[in-house]
Interface confidence: low
């Protein structure tokens, strides 16, 4: 003795990414010699048993038995979203509903607002926008491995009334360490299934130079050849160097090369040397105290750096 429920078809809700394929499966225990039918949200019949009713090549029959009717819809569009109805024409007609939710895939984000010639301690503001997501996607920012805290994602409905454009801004103060860094805006959305969809903006930061004097060899001795290298860093890289020997008034201006060369060291070369590295962002002066050691083989580290 069959209960009334045995003739009640059942199905399930489905979620599909736009452009993907969804399978609608309807099953019934007791078909009472009636065929199952699928219809779309506009109440157009798609399949009645194994007979195609709607001429749409995207819709294909998967399984048709007295107890099951399964169909697939490929290249699903946002317009395909809605309630699909499985019916069995018993007395009375029984139906089951399958809610098909179509996820809109967010577009690759677009970063705008980058202004070149940022200087150290300037404030940078970047904007990021991605259209086409459904439901609305979430945007996140990072600089290298560090998360940046941007504004909360703003959401705006797209003209089609189905998908959303999301946007976010981030503001941060730049440092010299940010020169060459990539600011990345990533879109997070269930349709991406964990895949990364992001856009990066490489930033350039102009900053004042620094310099360091490096002796070669590191422990100079009387009679040796010595090079003092003034290693300037900065953006832009320092283009001008000025060497001076302290103690003489005025200080002795020696060369404008980045390296100061002593072809043959004398004790009289001992003293404090300054190198001023200059770019159009400013200047930096590095010092080095040279103590010329005797030409003995015993190493000593009497030279000092500032």
């Amino acid at each position: 003795n069959l209960s009334q429920d045995d003739s009640q078809p059942w199905t399930s809700d489905e979620t599909v990414v736009a452009g993907g394929t969804v399978v609608l499966k309807c099953q019934v225990k007791d078909h009472e010699d009636s065929s199952l039918q699928w219809s779309n949200p506009a109440q157009q019949t798609l399949y009645f048993g194994e007979k195609r009713a709607l001429r749409d090549n995207r819709i294909q029959l998967v399984t048709s038995t007295p107890h099951e009717l399964s169909i697939s819809i490929s290249n699903v569009a946002l317009a395909d979203e809605g309630e699909y109805t499985c019916s069995i024409f018993t007395m009375p007609v029984r139906t089951a509903k399958s809610l098909v939710t179509v996820l809109g895939i967010p577009q690759k984000p677009i970063i705008t607002g980058y202004k070149s010639s940022l200087r150290e301690k300037d404030t940078a503001t970047l904007n990021c926008q991605s259209s086409g997501s459904k439901p609305a996607a979430r945007l996140t920012w990072r600089k290298g491995d560090q998360e940046l805290h941007g504004e909360p994602t703003r959401i705006q409905e797209d003209p089609n009334g189905k998908t959303f454009t999301v946007s976010s801004s981030v503001t941060f103060q730049v440092t010299r360490e940010d020169d060459g860094a990539s600011i990345v805006c990533s879109v997070n959305h269930e349709s991406l299934k964990g895949a990364d969809r992001s856009t990066s903006q490489r930033i350039e930061v102009l900053y004042t130079p620094t310099a360091m004097i490096r002796p070669d060899p590191p422990h100079p001795r009387e009679g040796q050849k010595l090079l003092l290298h003034c290693e300037g860093r900065g953006n832009p890289v320092p283009q001008q160097y000025l060497w001076e020997k302290e103690g003489s008034v005025p200080p002795l201006k020696m060369t404008q090369e980045s390296a100061l060369i002593f072809p043959f060291l004398n004790k009289s070369d001992s003293g404090t040397y300054g190198c001023t590295a200059t770019s159009n962002m400013g200047s930096y002066k590095a010092y080095y105290t040279l103590n010329v050691n005797d030409p003995s083989p015993v190493p000593s580290s009497s030279s000092t750096y500032h």
Epitope: G19, I105, Q107, K108, S131
Partner: nanobody, 124 residues
Framework: QVQLVQSGGGLVQPGGSLRLSCAAS????????RGWVRQAPGKGLEWVSA????????NYADSAKGRFTISRDNSKNTLYLQMNSLRAEDTAVYYC?????????????????WGQGTLVTVSS
């Protein structure tokens, strides 16, 4: 890796013509519809035109009808947009784009990969 590389923008006088190109790599070009989307200064994205995978079906926004022609050469994996009778309001960054699905996308949504954009300036 999907890449769309654009060329052909620039400055043109009102009434003049330009041809934009978009070379594709990293996917089977002939399997997918393609489209052009533009963004005028200070405005949102506006769909311009689309073409199906074979080139047999095309569609245009009202603002482009009769002046713009979309075409594709599947042997060269390249999409084109021929723009004639250009007007000042056509000034925008033009993006070529690949829809997420194989069906043409008649709107600015539904595209998953974008070219780098090319600026078209119409000014006298």
């Amino acid at each position: 890796q999907v890449q769309l590389v654009q060329s052909g923008g620039g400055l043109v006088q009102p009434g003049g013509s330009l041809r934009l190109s978009c070379a594709a790599s990293g996917f089977t070009f002939s399997n997918y519809a393609r489209g052009w989307v533009r963004q005028a200064p200070g405005k949102g994205l506006e769909w311009v035109s689309a073409i199906d995978y074979s080139g047999g079906s095309t569609n245009y926004a009202d603002s482009a009808k009769g002046r713009f022609t979309i075409s594709r050469d599947n042997s060269k994996n390249t999409l084109y947009l021929q723009m004639n009778s250009l007007r000042a309001e056509d000034t925008a960054v033009y993006y070529c784009a690949k829809p997420a699905s194989r069906r043409p996308s008649w709107d600015a949504d539904g595209y998953d990969y974008w070219g780098q954009g090319t600026l078209v300036t119409v000014s006298s």
